[in-house]
Interface confidence: low
């Protein structure tokens, strides 16, 4: 249970950054993920754009408490969730959103964490246990990362929608215009 950044002892730990870092897992009902930002049908993407500078993704602030076993931070921390399609800004959205927005063999751009910051938090524990101090790694900015079809699925999984947008407690319900009907096809849909 709990976030990968923690061990259940008194040590302070900041995990090493991997090339494709995983955002923190959901923390026992206390992570705010902007479910509404989960939405948005992938726009039609009729051609490949080479210039990554044209791509942008959303940096969504959210507040949550850090937990480590039964202990919880005295104050919530604020970090970013990386969200949104990485599409060229000049393209119009597809009204129905049922088509892939990249060429079948073209590049795939994902909105992923770019920079991190470390923050020390004090954890309060039940039963009169001594407070613990932790350093946690928080997402500080996001970027669009260009992938190719040659990236294997384990790499893709690291910043797939379920990782970037924890869905705990969400009941599946139909989306406007049936945009979820072909979610398997739209790998990068939320």
């Amino acid at each position: 249970q709990g976030w990968q950044a923690f061990k259940n002892d008194a040590t302070e730990i900041i995990p090493g950054l991997r090339e494709y870092p995983e955002p923190p897992q959901e923390l026992e009902n206390n992570q705010t993920m902007n479910r509404a930002e989960n939405g948005g049908r992938p726009p039609h993407h009729p051609y490949d754009t080479k210039d990554v500078s044209e791509y942008s993704c959303r940096e969504l602030h959210y507040t949550r408490f850090v937990t480590d076993g039964p202990c919880r931070s005295a104050k919530p921390v604020t970090e970013l969730v990386c969200s949104g399609q990485c599409g060229p800004a000049r393209l119009l959205p597809n009204a129905i959103g049922r088509v892939k927005w990249w060429r079948p063999n073209g590049p795939d751009f994902r909105c992923i964490p770019d920079r991190y910051r470390a923050q020390r938090v004090q954890l309060l524990c039940p039963g009169g246990a001594a407070p613990r101090s932790r350093k946690v790694r928080l997402v500080a900015s996001c970027k669009c990362k260009r992938l190719t079809r040659f990236h294997n699925q384990s790499e893709l999984k690291d910043f797939g929608p379920e990782t970037a947008r924890p869905q705990k407690g969400r009941k599946p319900r139909p989306r406007a215009r049936g945009a979820k009907a072909n979610q398997a096809e739209l790998e990068n849909a939320y």
């Epitope: 705010t32 049908r41 119009l92 959205p93």
Partner: antibody
């Protein structure tokens, strides 16, 4: 049908606090973000913050951070917005609004007029 | 914060006119733009979301277009009930921000 019903008008003194309620019905309260937006007389709309009642996660506009607190009572499907250290420029109509999955505010409360006057 | 600028701030038009309102974002917001209609003393009503998707129950004379930083709300044939103030709103980044509004008045 979806309804958001807000509490009645308030008149407050500068420096005091106000707590506005927003009772939701017609949908699963915990499944949607609930936002607060205000509108000063003759002015435009200003977003204040949001809550996700499922686990009480909140996000606030930097402008109001420290002065605004948004809470939710799941048992009554009611959200609350408390604004402290009131000043005359906080005189406005305060709206709650449900946020749909594509980021749109699809249902709004009728508004609560808060007047701050000495 | 992303600034949303609407133009014109007000316009006079007649029933049957084609009306165009523009909304400009201070930075690219892709398609994350909504339009609302507000009448005096009433709460805003959602018209269009995600740049061009019509909210349920909204007449088809309303349409939206644009991407990046420039967006347009068009009323193809203005009806008496359309005289109101219209707001754009971005949800690309927090905080959510609204345009200053465009008041559509009877000529």
């Amino acid at each position: 049908q979806v309804q958001l019903v807000q509490s009645g008008a308030e008149v407050k003194k500068p420096g005091s606090s106000v707590k506005v309620s927003c009772k939701a019905s017609g949908y699963t309260f915990t499944d949607y973000f609930l936002n607060w937006v205000r509108q000063a007389p003759g002015q435009g709309l200003e977003w204040m913050g949001t809550i996700y009642p499922y686990h009480d996660g909140t996000t606030y506009s930097q402008k109001f951070k420290g002065r605004v607190t948004i809470t939710a009572d799941k048992s009554t499907s009611t959200a609350y917005m408390e604004l402290s250290s009131l000043r005359s420029e906080d005189t406005a109509v305060y709206y709650c609004a449900r946020e749909e999955e594509d980021g749109q505010f699809d249902y709004w409360g009728q508004g609560t007029t808060v007047t701050v006057s000495s | 914060d992303i600034q949303m600028t609407q133009s014109p701030s007000s316009l006079s038009a007649s029933v049957g006119d084609r009306v165009t309102i523009t909304c400009s974002a201070s930075q690219g917001i892709q398609w994350y733009l909504n339009w609302y209609q507000q009448k005096p003393g009433k709460a805003p009503k959602l018209l269009i979301y995600y740049t061009s998707s019509l909210h349920s129950g909204v007449p088809s004379r309303f349409s939206g277009s644009g991407s990046g930083t420039d967006f347009t709300l068009t009323i193809s044939s203005l009806q008496p009930e359309d005289f109101a103030t219209y707001y754009c709103q971005q949800h690309s980044k927090l905080p959510r921000t609204f345009g200053g509004g465009t008041k559509v008045e009877i000529k």
